[in-house]
C-alpha cells in the first residue's frame, strides 16, 4: 500500500473527518491540500487500498496570478448508500513530483437498528404439519437478540430467551402470523409479517369401491384441516395412455384432467362417462375456505370390460339344399373390450336351437340335418368380450338361394332384449 | 458570481423526448455534485437524480429510472438532462441545483445553496 | 424511502410574530435535513443545513433545530419578505425527499 513519506511536509491542510451512521446513510468525506504549480489528481485509500471508481469530484482554487502559484484543491468522496463493506480507514493520496503523500485517516461505521438479512416469509402448510421459519439480523452495534411473536404475542420472556434464526413450529391449527424482532443497543427492528397459511392436509387412501365399463366409484379419507371445515373435494382423472409416464408424484398430466367435484361428506365420488375397458389416473385434493390441500400422488385404474353395445351388422342367411350360408360384419356400436368372438343360433319351426360359438370369423357354413325340408329356419348372431354377450340379432330367415340372384341381405336392428343362452352344451 | 441556467424546456407530446442544459458559472462544474429537482404545477418538489461530473457517475428517482440521463460536459461547464419517453405527469418546472460543499473534514447528507430560475417541460 | 411529514400546511400570521414550522421523519435522519424558502415563479432558496446550521447570507432571524425525527424552523419576528411557502428536506438516505411544504400567509 502507498506510504507517506516525511521527506517534505505533508500538503494537506484538511484531512477527512469521521463518519458513523445506519446502513443506507449518504455522507460525504473531505481532504484539502495545498500545493505549488501544477494541481495533483486526488486520490482515495479505503483500508490502505485505492478505490478506483470512487465517487469523488476535486476543485481546484488558484491562490495567485500565475500558474506556479500556489493552489488549494478540495476532494470530496461520495458514499451513497452506507453499507458494511464501506466501513473502515479513509486517506486521501497525492502524487507529488517523486513522492507520495497520504492524508491523516477517518473513519467510516456503521452503527444503527438491527438489519434484516432474511425475514419470515409467507407459507402454506398443511394443518398439524411441522414447519420451520427463519429471521437473521446484525447490527452493529452487535450482539443482536431475536423474539419471535406469534399473532403479535411475544414466544419467549425476553430478546435472546427463546429460538433465535430458526423457529420450528410443531404445527398449526389455523392460519396465523409470524414475525420477529430484532433487538440491539440502539434500539428495535421488526420484520416483515409473514401469514402462514393453514390448508387442509392430503387426503389419503385413494381407492376403487365399484368398477363399471363406464364409470368407477371411488373414495378416500380425508386429512385434518384445523379448525376450517372442508367445502368439498376435486377429483381428477386422466386418461394414461401406456407410454404417459405419470409417475407417483408428477405434479401434472399430459392433457386436460377431468374434473368432478364432490359435496364431503361422504368422501365419495362416481365417477360417470368414462370409456370401458381404459386405464385412467385419479387423484383427489380437499378444499376448506382457506384453500385447497396438496393433490394425492396419481393412482392408477381401469374401467372393466362391458359387452358389446349393439348386434353385429348387415347379416345374410342362404340356403341351398342342406347347406346355409350366413355372413355379417362387426357391430356399429361400441364394442366396450376385446371382441373375442360371435356366437351364432338358429332354430326352426319345430326343432330345438343349435348355438355355436364362432370365434373371430364373421362368416360360417352350416351343415342343415336331412334333407334340408326343415321349415322357417332363422339365424341370429351375437358378438362377445370378456364381459359377456352384446345383444342379439333379430332373427335372419334362411332364404332359398336361385342361381344368379344375389344373396339377400337384411339390415337389422338392435334387439331390446337379450335372449339368456347358457353355454355351449355341444 | 456562482450562477445556473436552465434552457431547453417546452412542450412535447407523451411519448416524446427533451434535452435540458444546466449551464455553470462563477463555479467549477467538477468541484460538486449537480442535481435536478422538479416541481409539478401547484406542487411540491421532487428530486430527479445528481450527477458527479468529475466522474460522469449518476443516480436516479424510481420514477425516472431508464427513461431520464444526466450527463455533464465539464469543458463546457455545463449538465445535461436527457428525458425520454415522457408522460403527463413528467410536467413540471425542472431546476437544476448545486450541492453545498462545507469545508469540514465530513458530513452527512447535504443540501443545495445555488439553484438555477427553472424552465417548464 | 424515507417520508417528510410537514406541520402544518399552511398559516397566517403577523409581521413580528414568531413562526414555527415542524417536519418529521418516518424514520431516524440524524441531523441531515435543510430547510428551504420558495417565492411564487422562484426558485427555492437555502435557509438552514445539517437541521441547524444558518446557510451564508441568511438572515438570523431564521433558525433550525431537531436531531433523528423530529425538525423544526422557527423565524423569530416574521418580516413582509418572509411571507413564501417552506420545504424541508432529508438526505440522510438516496433518494432526498421533501415535506409537502408549508404556505406562510399574511392575516
Known amino acids: 500500500a502507498p506510504r507517506g513519506t516525511q521527506a517534505e511536509e505533508s500538503p494537506f491542510v484538511g484531512n477527512p473527518g469521521n463518519i458513523t451512521g445506519a446502513r443506507g446513510l449518504t455522507g460525504t468525506l473531505r481532504c484539502q491540500l495545498q500545493v505549488q504549480g501544477e494541481p495533483p489528481e486526488v486520490h482515495w485509500l479505503r483500508d490502505g487500498q485505492i478505490l478506483e471508481l470512487a465517487d469523488s469530484t476535486q476543485t481546484q482554487v488558484p491562490l495567485g496570478e500565475d500558474e506556479q502559484d500556489d493552489w488549494i484543491v478540495v476532494s470530496q468522496l461520495r458514499i451513497t448508500s452506507l453499507q458494511l463493506s464501506d466501513t473502515g480507514q479513509y486517506q486521501c493520496l497525492v502524487f507529488l513530483g517523486h513522492q507520495t503523500f497520504v492524508s491523516q485517516p477517518g473513519y467510516v461505521g456503521l452503527e444503527g437498528l438491527p438489519y434484516f438479512l432474511e425475514e419470515p416469509e409467507d407459507r402454506t402448510v398443511a394443518a398439524n404439519t411441522p414447519f420451520n421459519l427463519s429471521c437473521q439480523a446484525q447490527g452493529p452495534p452487535e450482539p443482536v437478540d431475536l423474539l419471535w411473536l406469534q399473532d403479535a404475542v411475544p414466544l419467549a420472556t425476553a430478546p435472546g430467551h427463546g429460538p433465535q434464526r430458526s423457529l420450528h413450529v410443531p404445527g398449526l391449527n389455523k392460519t396465523s402470523s409470524f414475525s420477529c424482532e430484532a433487538h440491539n443497543a440502539k434500539g428495535v427492528t421488526t420484520s416483515r409479517t409473514a401469514t402462514i397459511t393453514v390448508l387442509p392436509q392430503q387426503p389419503r387412501n385413494l381407492h376403487l369401491v365399484s368398477r363399471q365399463p363406464t364409470e368407477l366409484e371411488v373414495a378416500w379419507t380425508p386429512g385434518l384441516s384445523g379448525i376450517y371445515p372442508l367445502t368439498h373435494c376435486t377429483l381428477q382423472a386422466v386418461l394414461s395412455d401406456d407410454g404417459m409416464g405419470i409417475q407417483a408424484g408428477e405434479p401434472d398430466p399430459p392433457e386436460e384432467p377431468l374434473t368432478s367435484q364432490a359435496s364431503v361428506p361422504p368422501h365419495q365420488l362416481r365417477l360417470g362417462s368414462l370409456h370401458p375397458h381404459t386405464p385412467y389416473h385419479i387423484r383427489v385434493a380437499c378444499t376448506s375456505s382457506q384453500g385447497p390441500s396438496s393433490w394425492t400422488h396419481w393412482l392408477p385404474v381401469e374401467t372393466p370390460e362391458g359387452v358389446p353395445l349393439g348386434p353385429p351388422e348387415n347379416i345374410s342367411a342362404t340356403r341351398n339344399g342342406s347347406q346355409a350360408f350366413v355372413h355379417w360384419q362387426e357391430p356399429r356400436a361400441p364394442l366396450q373390450g376385446t371382441l373375442l368372438g360371435y356366437r351364432l343360433a338358429y332354430q326352426g319351426q319345430d326343432t330345438p336351437e343349435v348355438l355355436m360359438d364362432i370365434g373371430l370369423r364373421q362368416e360360417v357354413t352350416l351343415e342343415l340335418q336331412g334333407d334340408g325340408s326343415v321349415s322357417n329356419l332363422t339365424v341370429c348372431v351375437a358378438a362377445y368380450t370378456a364381459a359377456g354377450d352384446g345383444p342379439w340379432s333379430l332373427p335372419v330367415p334362411l332364404e332359398a338361394w336361385r342361381p344368379g340372384q344375389a344373396q339377400p341381405v337384411h339390415q337389422l336392428v338392435k334387439e331390446p332384449s337379450t335372449p339368456a343362452f347358457s353355454w355351449p352344451w355341444w | 458570481e456562482v450562477q445556473l441556467v436552465e434552457s431547453g424546456g417546452g412542450l412535447v407530446q407523451p411519448g416524446g423526448s427533451l434535452r435540458l442544459s444546466c449551464a455553470a458559472s462563477?463555479?467549477?462544474?467538477?468541484?460538486?455534485?449537480i442535481h435536478w429537482v422538479r416541481q409539478a404545477p401547484g406542487k411540491g418538489l421532487e428530486w430527479v437524480g445528481w450527477i458527479n461530473p468529475y466522474r460522469g457517475y449518476a443516480y436516479y428517482a424510481d420514477s425516472v429510472k431508464g427513461r431520464f440521463t444526466i450527463s455533464a460536459d465539464t469543458s463546457k461547464n455545463t449538465a445535461y438532462l436527457q428525458m425520454n419517453s415522457l408522460r403527463a405527469e413528467d410536467t413540471a418546472v425542472y431546476y437544476c441545483a448545486r450541492e453545498y460543499s462545507g469545508w469540514g473534514g465530513s458530513s452527512v447528507g447535504y443540501a443545495m445553496d445555488y439553484w438555477g430560475q427553472g424552465t417548464l417541460v | 424511502d424515507i417520508q417528510m411529514t410537514q406541520s402544518p400546511s399552511s398559516l397566517s400570521a403577523s409581521v413580528g410574530d414568531r413562526v414555527t414550522i415542524t417536519c418529521r421523519a418516518s424514520q431516524d435522519v440524524s441531523t441531515a435535513v435543510a430547510w428551504y424558502q420558495q417565492k411564487p415563479g422562484k426558485a427555492p432558496k437555502l435557509l438552514i443545513y445539517?437541521?441547524?446550521f444558518l446557510y451564508s447570507g441568511v438572515p438570523s432571524r431564521f433558525s433550525g433545530s431537531g436531531s433523528g425525527t423530529d425538525f423544526t424552523l422557527t423565524i423569530s419576528s416574521l418580516q413582509p419578505e418572509d411571507f413564501a411557502t417552506y420545504y424541508c428536506?432529508?438526505?440522510?438516505?438516496?433518494?432526498?425527499?421533501f415535506g409537502q411544504g408549508t404556505k406562510v400567509e399574511i392575516k
Open positions: 462563477g463555479f467549477s462544474l467538477s468541484g460538486s455534485w
Open positions: 445539517s437541521a441547524s
Open positions: 428536506q432529508q438526505s440522510y438516505t438516496t433518494p432526498p425527499t
